[in-house]
Amino acid sequence: VLEVYYTSLRCRCVQESSVFIPRRFIDRIQILPRGNGCPRKEIIVWKKNKSIVCVDPQAEWIQRMMEVLRKRSSSTLPVPVFKRKIP
């Protein structure tokens, strides 16, 4: 599930990783745009092994993956798109 959250909370990520995560290991991705209490964009990935990691938004692999997901957002996805807005 790909989520885009708009939230007034402070930054969620206390550390970020650039290590590649194969898509088959990913259960859900959450994107937190910058602003609204956090000065940077954050990307949170839930893995199928019940772990969770913040991914460096500058990591090439996550940028490529996000682009693929956006392009496929009108069709069935391995990681379906889910957008949710929080006031």
């Epitope: 990520c13 206390v14 990783s17 949170i44 839930w46 019940k50 772990s51 969770i52």
Partner: antibody, heavy 122, light 107 residues
Amino acid sequence: QVTLKESGPGILQPSQTLSLTCTFSGFSLSTYGMGVGWIRQPSGKGLEWLANIWWDDDKYYNPSLQNRLTISKDTSNNQAFLKINNVDTADTATYYCARSELIMPYVPFDYWGQGVRVTVSS
Amino acid sequence: DIQMTQSPSSMSASLGDRVTITCQASQDIDNHLIWFQQKPGKSPRPMIYYATNLANGVPSRFSGSRSGSDYSLTISSLESEDMADYHCLQFKQYPFTFGSGTKLEIK
């Protein structure tokens, strides 16, 4: 308000099966990212992680005890369970259940029950 | 399995002292470490998460640090209410493993 409370037999004999129940409120094990774990602590000693169960029924066990442990849940009644087969005196401990929520920042075992004391004695 | 070697197992310190407890990880855990405080007869409570971050409601005299595979919990000025057992937990990978615990007593 998140609360958890453990219940169990108090005392049992070697070779019996220990059955523990964790009854919780303030969260649901049907919610994405929610999990409950079991941890034990022999008197005056350190903590030992035993098992976790997650919202999707995914289960993780401590390999040193895996063949004796069974974790399960009853989502509708907000309960989690742990069974330990073939107990021995070394299983005498206080048993805790604790919540984990897969959110960032991830703090496993952020809420704990009060613990239940279990004694294995012949 | 990842082994967490915690030291000291017990220590006694005076009020106002600076106190440090250490856990050494047998493999890289990349800051996936929590420090719990457990007061006598009570359940553990998270104090520090991701090695260096203070949990909600924890006094600022507590801090966490890392040097290589060594993770430390420091109390800058010991108070009587800090008398407790302290446990580290690695959650980098299953099985989660705790250190053996440190009993902190007041002189």
